[in-house]
């Protein structure tokens, strides 16, 4: 069979380097006084998203409906990817972490052009919406770098609430920092593969 394809996205060389690279870029942006949020991301990174237990996140998106699968992906199936766009957080999160000068890195997550993951805090759900920029606050998540090459995504609009897995679906989960900081159901892995 013949096929030909390539994609045009800027991303850091590897997962191990990305946080440090972003901190440097972000720090330079801060020194120059550039305003990032809502204008343009510091960097973008294309990655497949999986849970702590290595289940894949698949985005079944049509014009009028969508479903987000959390599942053991079949061997021959290519993993879906999300475009993570990194921004400077204007507000410190409820927890100190992966930032510079007390600020945080925020991300938006897009599985396809013009669509972004959004937090619905009333329904405690994670939704996909077609948006125009500037994106609403519900599309921004504070990024936390956890151990074992894992990350977690905290709602900008509701500190202490994270994207997590519940009943094989993505959901919003409130985390008690004193007890569940390392809770596996809010840990995700990013992979270039």
């Amino acid at each position: 069979m013949h096929h030909h394809h390539h994609h045009h996205h800027h991303h850091a060389a590897g997962l191990n380097d990305i946080f440090e690279a972003q901190k440097i870029e972000w720090h330079e942006a801060a020194i120059e006084g550039r305003s990032i949020t809502g204008i343009s991301p510091i960097t973008e990174y294309l990655a497949s998203l999986s849970t702590y237990n290595d289940q894949s996140i698949t985005f079944a998106l049509e014009d009028e409906s969508y479903e987000i699968y959390v599942e053991d992906l079949k061997k021959d199936k290519k993993k879906d990817k999300v475009l993570l766009s990194y921004y400077e957080s204007q507000h410190p999160s409820s927890e100190s972490g992966d930032g510079v000068d007390g600020k945080m890195l925020m991300v938006t997550l897009s599985p396809t052009k013009d669509f972004w993951l959004q937090a619905n805090n009333k329904e405690h759900s994670v939704e996909l919406h077609k948006c125009e920029k500037p994106l609403p606050d519900q599309a921004f998540f504070v990024l936390h770098n956890r151990s074992f090459n894992c990350v977690s995504f905290e709602c900008k609009t509701d500190p202490g609430v994270f994207i997590g897995v519940k009943d094989n679906h993505l959901a919003l989960i409130k985390v008690d920092y004193s007890e569940n900081l390392g809770s596996e159901n809010i840990l995700f892995k990013l992979s270039e593969i």
Partner: antibody, heavy 126, light 106 residues
Amino acid sequence: EVQLLESGGGLVQPGGSLRLSCAASGFTFSSYAMSWVRQAPGKGLEWVSGIADDFTSTYYADPVKGRFTISRDNSKNTLYLQMNSLRAEDTAVYYCARDLWMMNYAGGLRYPFGYWGQGTTVTVSS
Amino acid sequence: SYVLTQPPSVSVSPGQTASITCSGERMGDKYAAWYQQKPGQSPVLVIYRDTKRPSGIPERFSGSNSGNTATLTISGTQAIDEADYYCGVLKQDTGVFGGGTKVTVL
């Protein structure tokens, strides 16, 4: 309502060329990978070619590789199949098919073929 | 090239269950889809991702896939289910179809 309308079929001599078109409506055309599938008279379905991103991701079945070219014009919501060096075995009804789901940043075809056009008939004969 | 094998024909009495198989190497490692095609009409997707039904497809259509075989099951078969049925998979960004099975409702 998703609609796919093929055109451009007809009778052509062996070695000749045809260009098929598929006019799409009722959905965001640029967001979906598209394919051509054919069916020879009295035979089964045969996938011919697919396209994801505009011009950058194209895929072909071995029997048509080097002879057929798939393309799309997102501004016109239209899918094309340029068929050159046609052979008798290319005689078939050609269907335009849309992937069920929108394209993902991973690229490629999402599969399966969720929506089909009514088909256009191509006859290659001298 | 990857080959999917289906029985040429299956006969079933109204109200009974029809099962159509689709065999291929390590079929269970792929996601199977099934298409219904009535004479003179375009194919219609009836099952995708092994077991899922698109909206508008009756509940009597179901699917499974493991090992080397995917199966389409029509429970309580009706006369309107008489058609050709094709299985399909995606193999490295190329589509592959089975040869088709003609379901006859006696």
